[in-house]
């Protein structure tokens, strides 16, 4: 179905499940909040290790506009990026702050997307007559996943790009219609 590889051209940071690989981000008005959000949260899936609850993931937040061609989202979206290596929660903030990094001896734990939220964004386009919208799937949370030597690089890929919507049974389209969908959001576990 379709070409061998696919893309969607917006500035999403994260490629979407292999279907829509994204180019590198062009972040507009990018504010990095750089918070370690997930400290101490137990991972979504148990690993075969006893101190699972000790492992923590860094979730970095970026605020940016979604673009598509000459269009830009009316409002910025907040993108969550799962940051690299997992380590014991108590070591993460200080270790990162000092530029050091804890590495486990033994299995490799990586911080990868866990759940997604999808958001529909309204696009503002130059001279655009019709309201246009785009769906962007964004990472909602991260998790630590144990990687063995059998896991390949594809395990480490982040995923994402798409989104949400308004209500059924519409009468003939009023011009402002799609604004009702702007804030619709959902969360999806994969």
């Amino acid at each position: 179905q379709g070409w061998q590889a696919f893309k969607n051209d917006a500035t999403e940071i994260i490629p979407e499940l292999g279907e829509y690989p994204e180019p590198p981000p062009e972040l507009e008005n990018n504010k990095t909040m750089n918070r370690a959000e997930n400290g101490g949260r137990p991972p979504h899936h148990p690993f075969e290790t006893k101190d699972v609850s000790e492992y923590s993931c860094r979730e970095l937040h970026f605020t940016r506009y979604v673009t598509d061609g000459p269009c830009r989202s009316a409002k910025p979206v907040t993108e969550l990026v799962c940051s690299g290596q997992c380590g014991p929660a108590r070591l993460l903030p200080n270790a990162i702050g000092r530029g050091k990094w804890w590495r486990p001896s033994g299995p490799d734990f990586r911080c990868i997307p866990d759940r997604y939220r999808a958001q529909r964004v309204q696009l503002l386009c130059p001279g655009g007559e019709a309201p246009r919208a785009r769906k962007v799937r964004l990472v909602a949370s991260c998790k630590c996943k144990r990687l063995t030597r059998f896991h390949n690089q594809s395990e480490l890929k982040d995923f994402g790009t798409e989104a949400a919507r308004p209500q059924k049974g519409r009468k003939p389209r009023p011009r402002a219609r799609s604004a009702k969908a702007n804030q619709a959001e959902l969360e999806n576990a994969y």
Partner: antibody, heavy 118, light 107 residues
Framework: QVQLVQSGAEVKKPGASVKVSCKVS????????QHWVRQAPGKGLEWMGW????????EYASKFQGRVTMTEDTSTDTAYMELSSLRSEDTAVYYC???????????WGQGTTVTVSS | DIQMTQSPSSLSASVGDRVTITCKAS??????VAWYQQKPGKAPKLLIY???TRWTGVPSRFSGSGSGTDFTLTISSLQPEDFATYYC?????????FGGGTKVEIK
Amino acid sequence: QVQLVQSGAEVKKPGASVKVSCKVSGFPIKHHFQHWVRQAPGKGLEWMGWSDPEIGDTEYASKFQGRVTMTEDTSTDTAYMELSSLRSEDTAVYYCATGDTTYKFDFWGQGTTVTVSS
Amino acid sequence: DIQMTQSPSSLSASVGDRVTITCKASQDVHTAVAWYQQKPGKAPKLLIYWASTRWTGVPSRFSGSGSGTDFTLTISSLQPEDFATYYCQQYHDYPWTFGGGTKVEIK
């Protein structure tokens, strides 16, 4: 791999309705917009409308307004297009397509032939 | 409705030829134009959107250009698999509309 698989060919009488289905796999249907485009025999492409399965928003071409209904079942990732009051000029191949925007058609189904004949 | 007029309606070309298809909009559509390729008995495939952005996986021999009312799809070196019908589509204003198609045949 994104795949859209449509229901089989239909033969209908004038005045009847037809409902075409489109099963989406490869991602949740609600993460994209669903579009419907038709093509009469030997003719070009004609956009019918789009729907947003997440919230049920729809946009129909004015030509089909009042005759077309686009719905989805998000539990089965299936989109439906129902066209009523069929006439002979509705004989066409009906395609479902999906995309992350309301305006371009990224992936397409294989098409469903609808023949309207008395 | 915005009319999209494609020319020529058909053309004959040989493998290796440079092929140019044009699409003229009945009013200014900025760059809100996509191009699709359709082979007989098959569904169309997206090639180009926003007038010049190639859909990933589309070979680099396909390129699009134009803005306003005049748009062009160029195949720099025609390959055997490129013999098909090509359609332009505008998405500046509802309803989205397609051109009548250009059939590229083997000379």
